[in-house]
Interface confidence: low
Amino acid sequence: KFSKQSWGLENEALIVRCPRQGKPSYTVDWYYSQTNKSIPTQERNRVFASGQLLKFLPAAVADSGIYTCIVRSPTFNRTGYANVTIYKKQSDCNVPDYLMYSTVSGSEKNSKIYCPTIDLYNWTAPLEWFKNCQALQGSRYRAHKSFLVIDNVMTEDAGDYTCKFIHNENGANYSVTATRSFTVKDEQGFSLFPVIGAPAQNEIKEVEIGKNANLTCSACFGKGTQFLAAVLWQLNGTKITDFGEPRIQQEEGQNQSFSNGLACLDMVLRIADVKEEDLLLQYDCLALNLHGLRRHTVRLSRKNPIDHHS
């Protein structure tokens, strides 16, 4: 399923994007899954749909639940699910794990902390930043656009960083906060030619016609923060988005950092309702960084149903 977890705090704005993409010209309908009730598009409502975005202005704990978005084009529909949880504000300073966005790590050279989800909102500078609930002060801290830069990073700079900003909707202002952990790496990172862990080169993957199939492209690029590293799938040498087959989609997996400190990425290719013609395609897992590009090719073959004898 194309499902995405989203969370927010009561009385703050929360904006959720449909996990299925489509052209701006496509219409997107939103429903509350439990009741199948359509979400209104009129902006006077506290919860309303605006194209690919679902807006809670402000959010309430009772808004928690699963929301369905359907991207409609002239030739196909794509369905996604947004699993929304709204939490009560904490009275103490601690931010619970379930409210934390992904951890970022920095080093002396690279100490940017991006404010999570901010791109979804209509906000204006400046951003306010807090560390462990204390407002950040001093010349070492610079709020720049949607991120915080810390000069001369030290190990003591590790901790939970919260960004706070104001979302403006038709003249009304709503507060938004988002928190993520920042860790400091002592050792110097390095970058190397991409190493694809999966799939194996020229792998044959068995699939069943009519069933769903997933292919994972996983690669490692070095240690520490990587500048410009990517994994992606291509079909017959064409980007997935350009291939034009809505049954076949790619979805970013988790950024991984293994115990040995290697920075790895993966991209999952999801094929819905496998068809005969899918067996004729060439599936390329590409891993790319500044050193170059590595490609592993996969082909699909039909899995023969096993005869079950009693």
């Epitope: 410009l228 590293a229 991209m267 790319l288 500044l290 170059g292 590009l293």
Partner: antibody, heavy 124, light 108 residues
Framework: QVQLVQSGAEVKKPGSSVKVSCKAS????????VSWVRQAPGQGLEWMGR????????NYAQKFQGRVTITADESTSTAYMELSSLRSEDTAVYYC?????????????????WGQGTLVTVSS | EIVMTQSPATLSVSPGERATLSCRAS???????LAWYQQKPGQAPRLLIY???TRATGIPARFSGSGSGTEFTLTISSLQSEDFAVYYC?????????FGQGTKLEIK
């Protein structure tokens, strides 16, 4: 450090074709897109198209579609731009440029490296 | 195609002063795909800023970029004599990549 070295100036008759080369050294030629950008005398920059050698992918600006062909030879790290049916308004300096970077979102097509330019004069 | 419009066409500023150049896109462009170039007569363009605000290697700190959506700005904080040139913005958000028509920065 990537260096792009282009072929020399050309004088061509209207209706003919010109093929300009761009040899790369000092970088991973295959991975980076090579774009062609032209500049008519006293005018601004105009993107014509690009090739991503390792993916054998080309894209062209609509204006030049059908008249321009961009190719690449990975073995010599050389890109080529051929423009046919030349007319006087094609008189310009033609640059090759690279440095754009591909990731899962698409192309960050900024050009860090430029050739020295090739003047193509179309005159009868 | 996305049309990039630069203003002003010509900007006259004295050395040591601040120069602000504008670039407007005909439709929204993700800031990751916006670059600025400097070009001097008889030379190839030179990349100054990419990703709307990141300085390219070797570019002095007096050059800075900002903006998002359809409005982008290149600022030169204290003009040096070598900064007088033509400046172009460029988007690579969608094909065809397009450049602005250029802003000529001249000595006042």
């Amino acid at each position: 450090q990537v260096q792009l070295v282009q072929s020399g100036a050309e004088v061509k008759k209207p209706g003919s074709s010109v093929k300009v080369s761009c040899k790369a050294s000092g970088g991973t030629f295959s991975t980076f897109g090579v774009s062609w950008v032209r500049q008519a005398p006293g005018q601004g920059l105009e993107w014509m198209g690009r090739i991503i050698p390792i993916l054998a992918t080309t894209n062209y600006a609509q204006k030049f579609q059908g008249r321009v062909t961009i190719t690449a030879d990975e073995s010599t790290s050389t890109a080529y731009m051929e423009l046919s049916s030349l007319r006087s308004e094609d008189t310009a300096v033609y640059y090759c440029a690279s440095g754009d970077y591909y990731d899962s979102s698409g192309y960050y097509g900024y050009f860090q490296h430029w050739g020295q330019g090739t003047l193509v004069t179309v005159s009868s | 195609e996305i049309v990039m419009t630069q203003s002003p066409a010509t900007l006259s500023v004295s050395p040591g002063e601040r120069a602000t150049l504008s670039c407007r896109a005909s439709q929204s462009v993700s800031s990751s795909y916006l670059a600025w170039y400097q070009q001097k007569p008889g030379q190839a363009p030179r990349l100054l800023i990419y990703g709307a605000s990141t300085r390219a290697t070797g570019i002095p700190a007096r050059f800075s970029g900002s903006g998002s959506g359809t409005e982008f700005t290149l600022t030169i904080s204290s003009l040096q004599s070598e900064d007088f040139a033509v400046y172009y913005c460029q988007q690579s958000y969608s094909i065809p990549f397009t450049f602005g028509q250029g802003t000529k920065l001249e000595i006042k």
